[in-house]
Amino acid sequence: MMTGTIETTGNISAEKGGSIILQCHLSSTTAQVTQVNWEQQDQLLAICNADLGWHISPSFKDRVAPGPGLGLTLQSLTVNDTGEYFCIYHTYPDGTYTGRIFLEVLESSVAEHGARFQIP
């Protein structure tokens, strides 16, 4: 029986050009984590396998860094990075657990917007 739960950072926002850490945590289970996939619906970003280590997709090699821990750091963000990201924990003996993070990449910070409209 699968007793575990995935905690994620949930809905997050970051600034264009900046970076963000995608983080999931599996709790309430003694199952062994053997692999963690980081995916979008249509493609793999990265895999952390207990035996093989990290694999980063060539499409993301320049701007994805493994970690911290089983998390993933996305760098040089663009507005096209807005969307859903999923962590998939492969465990034994439970099976797979999936967590969802929605990332919104903003054009610029609120502070910058504010500065543009200051009265001289």
Epitope: Q35, N37, Q41, L44, N49, H55, F86, T98
Partner: antibody, heavy 118, light 107 residues
Framework: DVQLQESGPGLVKPSQSLSLTCTVT?????????WNWIRQFPGNKLDWMGY???????RYNPSLKSRISITRDTSKNQFFLRLNSVTTEDTATYYC???????????WGQGTLVTVSA | DIVMTQSHKFMSTSVGDRVSITCKAS??????VAWYQQKPGQSPKPLIY???YRYTGVPDRFTGSGSGTDFTFTISSVQAEDLAVYYC?????????FGGGTKLEIK
Amino acid sequence: DVQLQESGPGLVKPSQSLSLTCTVTGYSITSDYAWNWIRQFPGNKLDWMGYITYSGDTRYNPSLKSRISITRDTSKNQFFLRLNSVTTEDTATYYCARRELGQGFTYWGQGTLVTVSA
Amino acid sequence: DIVMTQSHKFMSTSVGDRVSITCKASQDVSTTVAWYQQKPGQSPKPLIYSASYRYTGVPDRFTGSGSGTDFTFTISSVQAEDLAVYYCQQHYSVPWTFGGGTKLEIK
């Protein structure tokens, strides 16, 4: 238990449109997952066509992009395939299937044979 | 597109034998390979995902291994009911692609 069932005409004329329905029972298509269409040609080759996600996003095989459309009716828990300008090369068994992240196609319909012929 | 190649279209084996089916990806797909079994007149049935993980209820005589570009599906002791076509599939990136299939024939 999750079940998928394809339905639609078994015979379509060349240059016409092929329209199929996948009815899902035991799970809401708006809850999670990507809901796919896959076809199998007479020689047994399997060909992924496209999907619609639980949130309504679609993605298609580039080889079909100009001809394919996948839509859904959430009130009936159904999703649909429309393939335009069919030729005899589109003769195949068409399957709908659920894809789970980090895995593969975990649930399949029983398939429906569509023959394109004049 | 990522091309998945199953070099053997047919394999002949006897009940009780060990048989291995291979699949090669045209690029590194890490461990994102699934295996399916299709019996005559039926839809494909998922057996293995992420190269080596068995789905619930799949007998433990079925195993998968490999990473990168080379993958193997093994039946440790073939049973008569294993007569089927076996397909590999990459779930690395769209378009998801399948191997051409290997038909297992029982002698």
